[in-house]
Interface confidence: low
């Protein structure tokens, strides 16, 4: 408890202050003094409020008394009630706390009485004559909000000194009522004044944030910087933002330029507007609006395919006439069977590999620990969260924490167990036109894809073949994922997988081969169900391994965590093929490219707002154009965006009920005991 001092002092909480004024006043004078400052005599109605009063009053003089806001009119005794007929100066008798010094007495009470609090001991309440001047009084001030006391910063000469709206000056406050002023003195001689003001958000806060004594260090509050505070050798302070963010106009906050950017597909921080829009592989910026992306018709490029070319949204495919098969470059055609037998044997060897060799050096995801569990006909997607960057916000997730259930055709065969061995870029022969996508074959060192030849395109398959990947994966000589730009990368592929002839169907593998797209080689291999004649093959895409950080795999842009076509998710398959693709899964890393979703046939929204109804798949052997369209997935909202600087708004003094009129004239005729404290 604080010792008694002759100076006024106060104790403030988030919504009210108690102030002690050690000045001799009558009850009416004390009430008026509190009212003039915008408050009222103290009304400690709860044990918590009484505790704050106790700590404020501390140890006062042995016989000292302080007026509180309780008075009783003549002949209004009610000894059986908690306040004994006394009324708070706010005009009511509500209370959850009393602290009378003496028991209630029966009998008449002819005179008006007022209550005072003992300045020492247990701060009990005594009743006595309202016209006596006592040692001091306690005021109470209510307000709409309070600002926390300012932390001491490096460079400050000492703690801030505060002036409250009720004219108390101190550096000891823990909370400062709305309308208070903080004066900060800096060691360099300068100073700053801050006002506790209303914020546009509705609360209250200091009118200035950030280093109050700039050039004098970062201090315990990180120099007011949202991300990183840098203290220069000369003592100057500057704020820096994490990669992908830029410093806001206030010099302290960090903002994500791509958060509000109107890019249709990909956004990268930088450029004159603070961001630049990019398009995915197979798309280019629209001429009339660089924020939009339009499909590139690669088939218009001379020589893009040796024989036939099919363009589709986001890519194209080369294929060959009957009796020819597509070569490994994905462009050229050669007579069927020229290289088939050995390649088929190589492929069979690859597929039957037990998966234990070379895993450490070839697979960037070798220690993925995830498992899959599927119900027949239902794919469960558990949302994963991006890593924590220590930032003051984290992205919202739609239906955060609830598994997203997609209703799929319930007549599938039972799901297979997840593959655990190394994942090879192997391809299985089929008797249907399984065409391989090559997203940019005209570039040098294009991906040499494995090939599936087809002899009679319109026919249904004779056997239930195993699924072939839409685009096989790359295997890199350095055993690492390459850096890939947002648009049309030069893909440094150094491995040519085997070629399988239609005349040598491969055996069913012990596990299914992965589907890995050319545009995003770090995709994780899917789990595939076997395929029946005339049905779609459903591709299961497991979650991206949590430890796999794609941050080093692409240009340093960034990406929303829950949007379609995230790196490592999208498998580019044309409608010509028999693959029916599942929606992409969310990654759990803030990866390379900041993407916004695009409607596409093979790309449903990341999380539908309601479950998709079961749909019976149809044969699409002759379909070239996309047959489904999906609405754009909602943008992930951002939290923690700093509100604009507020205009200081000063408080208005609230009016409270006046106490009952007090007898100010002489009290002749009243008993002698009315002028004493009992």
């Amino acid at each position: 408890q604080v010792p008694w001092t002759p100076e006024p002092r106060a104790a403030c909480g988030p919504s009210s202050c108690y102030a002690l004024f050690p000045r001799r006043r009558t009850f009416l004078e004390a009430w008026r003094a509190c009212r003039e400052l915008g408050g009222n005599l103290a009304t400690p109605r709860t044990p918590e409020e009484a505790q704050r009063v106790d700590s404020l009053v501390g140890v006062g003089p042995a016989n000292g008394l302080l007026w509180i806001g309780l008075q009783r009119q003549a002949r209004q005794c009610q000894p059986q009630r908690p306040l004994r007929g006394f009324i708070w100066t706010t005009g009511d008798q509500d209370t959850a706390f009393t602290n009378w010094a003496q028991p209630a007495t029966e009998g008449p009470c002819p005179a008006q009485r007022c209550a005072a609090l003992e300045a020492s001991g247990e701060h009990r309440w005594l009743e006595g004559s309202c016209t006596l001047a006592v040692d001091g009084y306690l005021c109470q001030f209510g307000f709409e909000g309070a600002c926390p006391a300012l932390p001491l910063e490096v460079g400050q000469a000492g703690p801030a000194v505060y002036t409250t709206p009720f004219n108390l000056v101190s550096s000891e406050f823990e909370w400062l009522p709305f309308g208070s002023v903080a004066a900060v003195q800096c060691q360099a001689g300068r100073g700053a004044s801050l006002l506790c003001v209303k914020q546009p958000s509705g609360g209250v806060g200091w009118s200035q944030t950030g280093p109050l004594c700039p050039g004098t260090g970062c201090g315990p509050d990180n120099g007011g910087c949202e991300h990183e505070c840098v203290e220069e050798v000369d003592g100057a302070v500057s704020c820096r933002c994490s990669e992908g963010f830029r410093l806001a106009a206030d010099g302290h906050s960090c903002e994500d330029p791509c958060a509000q950017a109107p890019c249709e597909q990909q956004c990268e921080p930088g450029g004159p507007q603070g961001y630049s829009c990019h398009c995915r592989l197979g798309f280019r910026p629209a001429e009339d609006d660089p924020h939009r992306c339009v499909d590139t018709d690669e088939c218009q490029i001379a020589g893009v395919c040796q024989q036939m070319c099919v363009n589709y949204v986001g890519g194209f495919e080369c294929y060959c006439s009957e009796g020819h098969e597509l070569e490994a470059d994905g462009i050229s055609c050669s007579p069927a069977g020229a290289m088939g037998a050995q390649a088929s044997q190589d492929l069979r060897d690859e597929l039957l590999d037990d998966g234990e060799e070379g895993e450490d050096e070839e697979e960037p995801w070798e220690d993925f620990d995830g498992t899959w569990t599927e119900e027949q006909g239902i794919l469960w997607l558990a949302p994963t969260h991006p890593p924590d960057f220590g930032l003051p916000y984290r992205p919202n997730f739609p239906q955060d924490g609830e598994p997203q259930r997609l209703h799929l055709e319930p007549t599938w065969p039972p799901p297979l167990s997840a593959p655990r061995g190394p994942y090879h870029s192997s391809v299985v022969s089929a008797t249907r036109p399984m065409v391989i996508s090559a997203t940019r074959p005209t570039l040098p060192s294009a991906h040499k894809t494995s090939v599936i030849s087809a002899t009679r395109p319109p026919l249904s398959p004779v056997h239930p073949p195993a699924m072939a990947p839409a685009t096989p994966p790359a295997v890199f000589s350095e055993h690492q994922i390459p850096k890939i730009k947002a648009n049309y990368p030069d893909l440094p592929f150094g491995h040519k997988p085997g070629i399988t002839s239609a005349t040598h169907p491969a055996r069913s593998p012990p596990y299914q081969p992965p589907i890995i797209s050319t545009n995003y080689p770090q995709v994780f291999p899917p789990h595939q169900a076997p395929m029946s004649p005339d049905t779609h093959t459903i591709t299961y895409l497991p979650p991206v391994p949590p430890h796999l950080d794609p941050g080093d795999t692409t240009s340093k842009a960034h990406q929303h965590p829950l949007l379609p076509d995230a790196p490592g998710i999208r498998t580019q398959a044309p409608q010509l093929s028999v693959s029916a693709l599942q929606p992409p899964l969310p990654t759990n890393s803030r990866s390379s490219v900041h993407e916004t979703p695009v409607p596409a046939a093979n790309q449903p929204p990341a999380f539908p707002s309601s479950p998709l109804p079961p749909q019976r798949p149809t044969n699409q052997t002759s379909s070239i154009s996309p047959t489904h369209s999906y609405s754009r997935a909602p943008l992930v909202p951002r939290e923690g965006v700093p509100s604009p600087k507020s205009v200081p708004q000063l408080p208005s003094v609230p009016s409270t009920a006046a106490p009952t009129a007090l007898a100010e004239s002489g009290l002749a005729g009243q008993s002698q005991r009315d002028d004493r404290w009992l």
């Epitope: 403030c12 909480g13 988030p14 926390p148 006391a149 932390p151 001491l152 490096v154 823990e174 909370w175 260090g217 970062c218 201090g219 315990p220 509050d221 990180n222 910087c225 949202e226 991300h227 990183e228 505070c229 840098v230 203290e231 003592g235 820096r240 220590g390 003051p392």
Partner: antibody, heavy 121, light 111 residues
Framework: QVQLVESGPGLVKPSQTLSLTCTVS??????????WSWIRQHPGKGLEWIGY???????YYNPSLKSRVTISVDTSKNQFSLKLSSVTAADTAVYYC?????????????WGQGTTVTVSS | QSVLTQPPSVSGAPGQRVTISCTGS?????????VRWYQQLPGTAPKLLIY???NRPSGVPDRFSGSKSGTSASLAITGLQTEDEADYYC???????????FGGGTKLTVL
């Protein structure tokens, strides 16, 4: 990955000065944006913040220990040190060094393994 | 003397949910300062579990969550596991200390 390692004598005589050093690897003390702190834990008891230092030398100390504590930094060695004078048996504890980050410079994201200091004659 | 008050011990059976409270004052939690939680397994240094009231560093399971209201905060652990048996400390900034303040610690026992 930032690593912190405490070093110093495990036994100190009463009234003497306890001296500990924390060596930081995997990151530079001078990089800015971080404070470097000492925390102690009495046997079977809770954690007590001793103080922290910025690479520029700005220090903040627990008021209850302020009169006896000095924390210093040597950026050339990527080290910071604790000196606690006039020790008594009540200063027997496990002493941890830690990196501090965040707006209020108050959360400890990397800790040393701790070193036990016994004050005894 | 500023303090953050925690219950000395809590317990729960595997799979259950337990909460640990941390009560401060208007000079620390009530002043708007963030609350952090640390887990200290026997014989090891404390490890950051929750920062900024309710955020988990990477690697911390989502079974751990934090919340803050007024002058107090709490740590909730759902799906209790035997490896969660440890001491848990809350921590905040304190304006009167101009520095960090730890709670007294809570020993969690998994029955």
């Amino acid at each position: 990955q930032v690593q912190l390692v405490e070093s110093g004598p495990g036994l100190v005589k009463p009234s003497q000065t306890l001296s500990l050093t924390c060596t930081v690897s995997g990151g530079s003390i001078s990089s800015g944006g971080y404070y470097w702190s000492w925390i102690r834990q009495h046997p079977g008891k809770g954690l007590e913040w001793i103080g922290y230092i910025y690479y520029s030398g700005s220090t903040y100390y627990n008021p209850s220990l302020k009169s006896r504590v000095t924390i210093s930094v040597d950026t050339s060695k990527n080290q910071f040190s604790l000196k606690l004078s006039s020790v008594t048996a009540a200063d027997t504890a496990v002493y941890y060094c830690a990196r501090v980050r965040g707006r209020s410079a108050t959360y400890f994201d990397y800790w040393g393994q701790g070193t036990t200091v016994t004050v005894s004659s | 003397q500023s303090v953050l008050t925690q219950p000395p011990s809590v317990s729960g059976a595997p799979g259950q949910r337990v909460t640990i409270s941390c009560t401060g004052s208007s000079s620390n939690i009530g002043a708007g300062y963030d609350v952090r939680w640390y887990q200290q397994l026997p014989g090891t240094a404390p490890k950051l579990l929750i920062y900024a009231n309710n955020n988990r560093p990477s690697g911390v399971p989502d079974r751990f969550s934090g919340s803050k209201s007024g002058t107090s905060a709490s740590l909730a652990i759902t799906g209790l596991q035997t490896e969660d048996e440890a001491d848990y400390y809350c921590q905040s900034y304190d304006i009167s200390l101009s520095g960090s303040l730890f709670g007294g610690g809570t020993k969690l026992t998994v029955l």
